[in-house]
């Protein structure tokens, strides 16, 4: 029961972070104009990933597409990449977990099969969640360095009294849902990759037979394969071998976890 | 058609108050915002305050910042300017002017003005 | 502040000739966000109030006749009457459309020679 619930808790929390992680990187505002100490400006400036946007006093915004591709700089690209990928990883990984959830009967699939795929998907929100937590802080470092980059020269003098006032940029709220997004489908990955290792059948519990044979006990014990990685054929409800010669006394012998043929 | 009516306009002594309206008509009144702009007797344009859609943000030109106060009422399509402690250099013409939508913020829009005078 | 600064503060132009009106920001009006310049112009006749003639340094307000245009970028901007009309005597503005308070030039007296 605690398995299933770690299993469909974790897809939901992955579910809600794939879908944040995909708002942020569709939102506009990653870096938003500082207000703090600037000249009271008629307009509010902001950008995102794809495009960027002003919005004038008046309520009317305007937005305009990067619609180059060689002349974006090097990090905004990468950034990007890192998003996206995330967003195909996650994307896969929900597909995935979906046919891993234990309440979910599809024919007649094994619960190992199940804790191999819990296990991928689970592996693939984390890379998600690293993924986009990199591309958001990746950008928040460039937001920071152009920042005091741009408050060590605020006022650029252009020919005597003219002045430039430089617009600064601070963190817009696609960072903070990014953050917040890469986090919880990290967090889903790991309660699934949590959930695939009771789902694998840690042993089989089954009737060991022993042979008394001239004088020596040798204890035969079958179906003793342990898999507690998920990987390889589940035998945890299969009876395999249950019977065959029993000695006088009907001794009966149990694997313990030390036990291998 | 789009129009600007101010009122409340008149003679008032030094240290005295007045309250300007605009009443607008024939657009949302409530998706835009408004400025209040003031010309003295022969001279040149100063602009007053401005007050957003939502009646916030509101910005002032700092000098008369603490003595004048906009505000509005979208309910009744109205525009107000409460003036206290005025003084003889208030002497001007005031005119509500409409912040135009996709206009880079210019007044699209301006009443006609009510004359404001200031005088012992 | 910002100070618009225009000049001159009165022209006289012959009727059919060419009107230039300069203006000069104490500082940039081109906002980097968009590359647009903020800056309009206004003109008013006497008794009349302002009426919007160009607003973005360059675009005309719809009904505006195309003898008057704008240009212009940064700090710099002109509004340029090609053909003067008895209709065009007014006095011409520019205003600051970037950063509050949302000043105006001083204003620019245009008559008929």
């Known amino acids: 029961m605690a398995v299933t619930a770690c299993q469909g808790l974790g897809f939901v929390v992955s579910l809600i972070g794939i879908a944040g992680i995909i708002a942020a990187t569709c939102m506009d505002q990653w870096s938003t104009q500082d207000l703090y100490n600037n000249p009271v400006t008629a307009v509010f400036n902001y950008q995102g990933l794809w495009r960027s946007c002003v919005r004038e006093s008046s309520g009317f915004t305007e937005c305009r597409g990067y619609f180059t591709l060689l002349g974006l700089p090097a990090m905004l690209q990468a950034v990007r990449a890192l998003m996206i990928v995330g967003i195909v990883l996650g994307a896969i990984g929900l597909l995935v977990s979906i046919f891993a959830l234990k309440c979910i009967r599809i024919g007649s699939m094994e619960d190992s099969a199940k804790a191999n795929m819990t296990l991928t998907s689970g592996i693939m929100f984390i890379v998600s969640g690293l993924c986009a937590i990199a591309g958001v802080s990746v950008f928040a470092n460039m937001l920071v360095t152009n920042f005091w980059m741009s408050t060590a020269n605020m006022y650029t003098g252009m020919g005597g009294m003219v002045q430039t006032v430089q617009t600064r940029y601070t963190f817009g709220a696609a960072l903070f849902v990014g953050w917040v997004a890469g986090g919880l489908t990290l967090i889903g990955g790991v309660m699934m990759c949590i959930a695939c290792r009771g789902l694998a059948p840690e042993e089989t519990n089954y009737k060991a037979v022993s042979y008394h044979a001239s004088g020596h006990s040798v204890a035969y014990k079958p179906g003793g394969f342990k898999a507690s990685t998920g990987f390889g054929s589940n035998t945890k409800n299969k009876k395999i071998y249950d019977g065959g010669a029993r000695t006088e006394d009907e001794v009966q012998s149990y694997p313990s976890k030390h036990d291998y043929v | 058609e789009v129009q600007l009516v101010e009122s409340g306009g008149g003679l008032v002594q030094p240290g005295g108050s007045l309250r300007l309206s605009c009443a607008a008509s024939?657009?949302?009144?409530?998706?835009?915002?408004m400025h209040w702009v003031r010309q003295a007797p022969g001279k040149g344009l100063e602009w007053v305050a401005y007050i957003s859609s939502g009646s916030s943000p509101i910005y002032y030109v700092d000098k008369l910042k603490g003595r004048f106060t906009v505000s509005r009422d979208n309910a009744k399509n109205s525009l107000y300017l409460q003036m206290n402690s005025l003084r003889a250099e208030d002497t001007a013409v005031y005119y509500c002017a409409r912040a135009g939508y996709a206009v880079r913020n210019a007044l699209d829009y301006w009443g006609q003005g009510t004359l404001v005078t200031v005088s012992s | 502040d910002i100070v618009m600064t225009q000049s001159p503060d009165s022209l006289a132009v012959s009727l059919g000739e060419r009107a230039t009106i300069n203006c000069k920001s104490s500082q940039s009006l081109l906002n980097v966000g968009n590359q647009k310049n903020y800056l309009a112009w206004y003109q008013q006749k006497p008794g009349q109030p302002p009426k919007l003639l160009i607003y973005?340094?360059?675009t005309r307000e719809s009904g505006v006749p195309d003898r008057f245009s704008g240009s212009g970028s940064g700090t710099d901007f002109t509004l340029t009457i090609s053909s003067l009309q008895a209709e065009d005597v007014a006095v011409y503005y520019c205003?600051?459309?970037?950063?509050?308070?949302?000043?105006f030039g001083g204003g620019t007296k245009v008559e008929i020679k």
């Open positions: 973005g340094a360059s």
């Open positions: 024939g657009f949302t009144f409530s998706s835009f915002g």
């Open positions: 205003q600051n459309d970037l950063f509050y308070p949302l000043t």
